[in-house]
């Protein structure tokens, strides 16, 4: 299985390669075969990645910021390939390789242009600040400076703030919105051009639920097909907001199945779950339990959030008795 | 065809420098490694020096070391050779050498020389 | 540094005669050896690398064998135009040393 790069041609044998942060990459290069084989890798013309020639490495003047992270394919030489094996790419390693490849026929020079992109996973959270309710799109970090965008009932708001902090290697950003009072359906997306990699965040605010104390209340979360693919590894949680934070009260891992439950009156249907229905039913309900509750399911490219406003009223015994 | 032309010899006196040039042609020159070989009227080849393709890398036999400097210049397509505190026994032809590849095997094709000479 | 040291340092033989010339270097040099041909008056001229690959254009009459120390270069049937001086030189790593030489004539 090789690494997660792409190879772009482009003409005057210089290619494209697309790598990501940390991850381990190749960059092609290939002769005619022939005898006395001699394969110089360098960086930027400059500095010394990899030499192989008389049938072996030679790494002494080898830059040492390419120490124990670069190998030939050594089995693959006398066939004609030349490709440099690269260990955890960063930032730093991003630019111009040139591989000079010769044999007692020809030399030959090809040049690899390395980029590399980063992207952690992003998340939308949703947050209550004071009276004012904000979703804010967050990437903790990412290379290139991403594309983020916010729809409004589908629709693209032009309103768009972005708190930006860089690091050496990296961008991380923030990007809030504020929701205050709107009962729309609110979608952020996240895009790495280099990566080819996009994110979406939706947020959907369900009508509001009036509930009698002891009665149980359902709550619905089924992910939109747009963006859910089951066969891909996802994680559902349930949280209740109280006094301006979240308490976790289920969740459930796609990869293990398994179901973590921290409240005694919450119920999943595990039918449901098979059916990637994550609705679930709190019983028994009592006065404190009033407030918005949040489903979130998340991937690596989406989070799908849904809120609830639960209502619990007293029930008329209750009433009475007061 | 590999054509390797030098020139730059000439009579000198002890001590002095004299820098000897190596047109080459026919070739992708920035592609090789190149030698100096000298070789006194009559006797053998002494190997003198050795610069890889992009110029990283040089070599000298003791002989010389610390007094000949070879280098190149590969947008001119020339290989150089300053030699200083020039001694009377560096007197020879000089051959400017072309490397089968990148200035880490044996030379495949010969200038014609220039003759130094070291005399008081 | 590995010293090359050849022999004989000269020798005459009839056209038509089988002629070796040795080469022995001081420390292993794997097959990293190649032979040159120096006529009077003219370059050198590259017969054998990789101890016995025959370079192009090279008469089939001109061998090279052996690995490590000991190296043989070998006329199978000497010719007028094969007067000429003998160099082996080791490539394995710089100094990229050459041999004395061998002078070899006709009788």
């Known amino acids: 299985i090789f690494p997660l790069a792409f190879f772009i041609y482009v003409p005057m044998n210089e290619q494209i390669v697309i790598g990501r942060l940390d991850e381990d990459i190749i960059l092609p290069s290939s002769f005619e075969r022939g005898s006395e084989v001699v394969i110089h890798w360098k960086y930027q013309d400059s500095y010394k990645v990899h030499s192989y020639y008389k049938g072996s490495d030679h790494l002494e003047s080898q830059d040492p910021r390419y120490a124990n992270r670069t190998s030939l394919f050594y089995n693959e030489i006398q066939n004609g390939n030349a490709s440099l094996f690269f260990r955890r790419v960063s930032l730093l390693d991003e630019g111009i390789y040139t591989c000079y490849v010769g044999t007692a026929i020809q030399v030959i020079t090809n040049k690899v242009v390395l980029k590399v992109g980063v992207f952690l996973t992003p998340v939308m959270k949703y947050e209550k600040r004071n009276t004012n309710s904000f979703l804010i799109c967050s990437v903790l970090s990412v290379y290139p400076r991403p594309i983020i965008t916010w729809k409004m009932d589908n629709t693209p708001i032009s309103e768009n703030n972005m708190e930006e902090t860089g690091s050496l290697d990296s961008f991380s950003i923030n990007s809030p919105l504020n929701i205050t009072g709107s009962n729309s359906s609110y979608e952020c997306t996240i895009e790495n051009s280099l990566l080819k990699q996009t994110w979406t965040g939706r947020w959907t605010m369900k009508d509001g639920l009036h509930k009698m104390q002891s009665e149980h209340v359902s709550l619905s979360c089924q992910p939109v097909n747009d963006y859910f693919s089951p066969n891909q590894d996802f994680k559902v949680t349930w949280s209740r907001m109280k006094s301006g934070t979240f308490s976790v009260l289920a969740y459930y891992l796609s990869s293990s199945q398994n179901t973590i439950i921290n409240e005694s009156r919450f119920s999943w249907n595990k039918e449901l779950i098979n059916q990637s229905d994550f609705s679930m039913n709190l019983m028994d309900l009592n006065l404190s339990d009033s407030g918005e509750y949040l489903c979130n399911i998340s991937s690596d490219e989406y989070t799908l959030l849904t809120i609830h406003t639960v209502h619990v009223e007293p029930s008329q015994e209750t009433a009475s008795h007061n | 065809q590999v054509q390797l032309v030098e020139s730059g010899g000439g009579v000198v006196q002890p001590g002095r420098s004299l820098r000897l040039s190596c047109a080459a042609s026919?070739?992708?020159?920035?592609?090789?490694?190149m030698h100096w070989v000298r070789q006194v009227p009559g006797k053998g080849l002494e190997w003198v020096a050795v610069i890889w393709y992009e110029g990283s890398e040089k070599d000298y036999a003791d002989s010389v070391k610390g007094r000949f400097t070879i280098s190149r210049d590969n947008s001119k397509n020339t290989l150089y050779l300053q030699m200083n505190s020039l001694r009377v026994e560096d007197t020879a032809v000089y051959y400017c050498?072309?490397?089968?590849?990148?200035?880490?095997?044996?030379?495949?094709?010969w200038g014609q020389g220039t003759l130094v000479t070291v005399s008081s | 540094d590995i010293q090359m040291t050849q022999s004989p340092s000269s020798l005459s033989a009839s056209v038509g005669d089988r002629v070796t010339i040795t080469c022995r270097a001081s420390?292993?040099?794997?097959?990293?050896l190649a032979w040159y041909q120096q006529k009077p008056g003219k370059v050198p001229k590259l017969l054998i690398y990789a101890a016995s690959t025959l370079q192009s254009g090279v008469p089939s009459r001109f061998s090279g064998s052996g690995s490590g120390t000991d190296f043989t270069l070998t006329i199978s049937s000497l010719q007028p135009e094969d007067v000429a001086t003998y160099y082996c030189q080791k490539y394995q790593s710089a100094p990229f040393t050459f041999g004395p030489g061998t002078k070899v004539d006709i009788k």
């Open positions: 420390q292993g040099i794997s097959n990293y």
């Open positions: 026919g070739f992708t020159f920035s592609n090789y490694g």
């Open positions: 050498a072309k490397d089968l590849i990148s200035g880490i095997y044996y030379v495949d094709h």
